[in-house]
Amino acid sequence: KSPVFGPQEVSSVEGNSVSIKCYYPPTSVNRHTRKYWCRKGASGRCITLVSSEGYVSSNYAGRANLTNFPENGTFVVNIAQLSRDDSGHYKCGLGINSRGLSFDVSLEVSQGPELPNGTEVYTVDVGRTVTIKCPFKTENAPKTKALYKKIGQTSVLVIDSRNYVNPNYKDRIRLRIPGTGQLIFTVVIDRLRLSDHGLYLCQAGDGSNRDEKNADLQVLEPEPELVYEDLRGSVTFHCALGLEVANVAKFLCRVNSRETCDVVINTLGKRDSAFEGRILLNPQDKDGSFSVVITGLRKEDEGRYLCGAHSDGQLQEGWPIQAWQLFVNEESTIPRSPTVVKGVAGGSVAVLCPYNPKESQSLKYWCLWEGAQNGRCPLLVESQGLVQEQYEGRLSLLQEPGNGTFTVILNQLTTQDAGFYWCLTNGDTRWRTTVEIKIIEGEPNLKVPGNVTAVLGETLNIPCHFPCKFSSYEKYWCKWSNTGCQTLPSQDEGPSEAFVNCDENSRLVSLTLNPVTRADEGWYWCGVKQGHFYGETAAVYVAVEEKKVAGSRYVSPAKADAAPDEKVLDSGVREIENKAIQDPRLFAEEKVVADTGDQAGGSRASVDSSSSEEQGGSSK
């Protein structure tokens, strides 16, 4: 007896799709061995049609796939565009077709119900519109036109040209009689319901000379599109409901165990709190289509999702919908990274952002999720060097450590920086991730002057005090510009008095500018790192003024002024149009910030480094 299990009999109709789920014991060997779907021939041999190793037979090309879910001990075979030729005996199994674990499946594809001769078949999804065409002869042109629904042996009048409308079809049906010469009338039914399903009869005239035409209306609940995404990754639901509902409120909902549908997000401003910080509803195009992006996928996000349109912003019968079944793969290619990063007011965070390592050349972005209305995510920084103006001097995107991870550093933190941020690239959209920054009680670990004024032509020495716990870290000074932070030479000056409870391992690292030039004006960062992994940073702004007094200036924290006020985003910022979801900007506001001056060259003093105990504040 094989431990593989599945449906023994699958019955469907031509043109339809099937999704065959096979179950296997999820042992380590079974999870990683080959999975296959094969057809049994007369000889008893089983010919592979599709396998987990990527093979698809020519007969199945473009219409079938096999997806393994190792964590569940299941694999799913999807076959679309069924024909009668697909009827037969199959096996789903593990290992080798001829000997291995398998399960027999019988697939029967039928033609569908027998219909009266000349019946026209209309197959339409629930909520959509159907136009039934009814031909007639010239002599019946002036006579009554009508549409009946056949229920058992009786015919129930639905609509006629004398303005009768059956109450079940009120406000959603119309009969159109064309101008002279056109011998066809049409009946248009909007917002189709499942109960509209059935056989209809068009009639023109009466008596033995009347014209009749049968129409079989099949109203289908949309087959859910199967979507497989990785844990911690991102999914995009593209929803195209048609022009008829272009100006109607849109929604995405998730079907619950009671088979009702809980709103996840809608265009009326409603959003499920479980998706806070990780969902956006992209603005709709002129044709009424829209898309919803969900990042930071969790196992509990699995389920059936419907998008739709209705003035209430929620599911109502007879309105168009689209369906997806989302599966979240726990054996994810997307590495674990902290979903919450904590920093203190005045301090900094270093956020690690994963990206598809096959796309190292892709442009990297970081945006701030805003929950108002449908959500938006204005870009704050990108790898080409653009930084939003109000983040000047305190935000940088670094390509390090590379190989599937980039780093974003944000310093001079305030409580207003708390919130959700998205890491994204212009490549694989499934690698979008979300991180929440929380501002907690505490003091920054690095101490630098708040504001420094340097004198042209003289020497400037800027101290940066470190606590003992950073003794093994590499320390650096860099000059910030909107394209990054260029490392500068610095000097390790031994013990610091800034941390009274600290032992002699506390350090003071200084930056010396000698002589000061106009180009030295700008933001400087003092920071710690371990290899390519960045830790805390502190920023100081250096203003340069004309010589007033001779001599060198040494700035101590006691004399430091407050950091300059942050610039407020000007009202002239333009909103970037979102081109579906290929545009990574996600309603980004874009502002090119002028470079803050030449990047100073030189090499920094070497400082010891070893393993890190903390990255970008504590990450829990």
């Epitope: 299990f5 449906p7 023994q8 009999e9 699958v10 019955s11 469907s12 109709v13 339809n16 799709s17 099937v18 999704s19 065959i20 179950y23 569908g112 289908l220 609940e221 087959e223 859910p224 079907v255 165990s257 009671r258 088979e259 009702t260 059936r304 079944q325």
Partner: nanobody, 127 residues
Framework: QVQLVESGGGLVQPGGSLRLSCVAS????????MAWFAQAPGKEREFVAA??????????YYADSVKGRFTVSGDNAKKTLDLQMKDLKPEDTALYFC??????????????????WGQGTQVTVSS
């Protein structure tokens, strides 16, 4: 409220046949999966057969012990489920339960994957 009502149970001789029926009322959905489970005295509830629907496709599942002897059928729209039992054996004696669930996901053999249950109908196979 939701009700699943089984019928058709009874006493039958080994080798005989029975047809069980189940009608669901009050379900907040057109059930996407319905199943039969059997519980013999002092034993766990065991999977017998199930049928799942997605659109105009149906999927029928059977326990190894009933393959070729039992046939499951049903109507998604009418929320009905039938089990034609042939060549009955004494070990088929049990209380037969009808179960329903809103979607066709999850292993159909696991009783925890069904949300609604009937009270059961007794089948006794004895000479």
């Amino acid at each position: 409220q939701v009700q699943l009502v089984e019928s058709g149970g009874g006493l039958v001789q080994p080798g005989g046949s029975l047809r069980l029926s189940c009608v669901a009322s009050g379900l907040p959905f057109s059930s996407s999966r319905m199943a039969w489970f059997a519980q013999a005295p002092g034993k766990e509830r065991e999977f017998v057969a199930a049928i799942g629907w997605r659109g105009r496709t149906s999927y029928k599942y059977y326990a190894d012990s009933v393959k070729g002897r039992f046939t499951v059928s049903g109507d998604n729209a009418k929320k009905t489920l039938d089990l034609q039992m042939k060549d009955l054996k004494p070990e088929d004696t049990a209380l037969y339960f009808c179960a329903a669930h809103p979607n066709d996901d999850g292993d159909p053999r696991i009783s925890g994957n069904y949300q609604y249950w009937g009270q059961g109908t007794q089948v006794t196979v004895s000479s």
